[in-house]
């Protein structure tokens, strides 16, 4: 859920990491009220999840491994 | 080694409420998701939802939210699941599992299930 | 909901034979998905994951394979100890979803 680009409130769903290509953060400013994670995935959507849950934060590093190893 | 402890029956009137456990032993019980797996008779197997210990997150298959509660005590590494408003739809076998994120997210340890039989 | 559609529902074939059971999901799950093995009685146990992985303390007699929207669980050499319903299991996002499993019995 997003407004003008910003993440409103998060998704209620978990998702695989075979699923993610990649990800911005968002973070609470006077643009945003929320930080976020942005989770772009294959089907070309951009899921809003939630930076303090441990699924999200898994995902987020396996990812930052991945772009280390470049 | 992991072992997920489950009471075998309960037997519940209709309309109640029934709150099932599932103790966890023989892994750090934080480090896992729990999920929570319907099997009525003869049919296949549902997902229900899952908690994640660490932080107490929960989500639910749509067709169980307001039917099914997750909850956990780290303390005492126990998962629960409460179902209210109870009717024979409900009558089924309800397993608790692991889920390990390492593993694919898959359900890696599964608890012997407990039979909720929904009578008056 | 990702629908995850398994043929057959029920299977019987004679020890020492090879069988096949497949699964469809109604998109493409990239390979997020999971065989579950549950002998009568007993409660489900992990035989693949990740589509191609055996899991722990699994024989070597059961193998996954296939990608995007089609995947299959091969049974090589069938064994009496075989007999039980197979499901196999979306993990790609949840609500997680099984197939509606496959019976297999020996001739």
């Known amino acids: 859920a997003s407004n003008f680009d910003c993440c409103l409130r998060y998704t209620d769903r978990i998702l695989h990491p075979k699923f993610i290509v990649g990800f911005t953060q968002q973070l609470a400013n006077e643009t945003c009220d929320i930080n976020a994670v942005v989770f772009h995935t294959k089907k070309g959507l951009s899921v809003c999840a939630n930076p303090k849950q441990t699924w999200v934060k898994l995902i987020v590093r396996r990812l930052s491994k991945k772009i280390n190893k470049m | 080694q992991v072992q997920l402890q489950q009471p075998g029956a309960e037997l519940v009137k209709p309309g109640a409420s029934v709150k099932m456990s599932c103790k966890a032993s023989g892994y750090t019980f934080t480090n896992y998701w729990m999920h929570w797996v319907k099997q009525r008779p003869g049919q296949g197997l549902e997902w229900i939802g899952v908690?994640?210990?660490?932080?107490?997150?929960?989500t639910y298959n749509q067709k169980f939210k307001g039917k099914a509660t997750l909850t956990v005590d780290t303390s005492s590494s126990t998962a629960y699941m409460q179902l209210s408003s109870l009717t024979s739809e409900d009558s089924a076998v309800y397993y608790c599992t692991r889920g390990n994120y390492g593993v694919d997210y898959a359900m890696d340890y599964w608890g012997q299930g407990t039979s909720v039989t929904v009578s008056s | 909901d990702i629908q995850m559609t398994q043929s057959p529902a029920s299977l019987s074939a004679s020890v020492g034979e090879t069988v096949t059971i497949t699964c469809g999901a109604s998109e493409n799950i990239y390979g997020a998905l999971n065989w579950y093995q549950r002998k009568q009685g007993k409660s489900p146990q992990l035989l693949i994951y990740g589509a191609t992985n055996l899991a722990d303390g699994m024989s070597s007699r059961f193998s996954g394979s296939g990608s995007g929207r089609q995947y299959s669980l091969k049974i090589s050499s069938l064994h009496p100890d075989d007999v039980a319903t197979y499901y196999c299991q979306n993990v790609l996002i949840t609500p997680y979803t099984f197939g509606g499993g496959t019976k297999l019995e020996i001739k």
């Open positions: 908690i994640d210990p660490s932080d107490s997150y929960t």
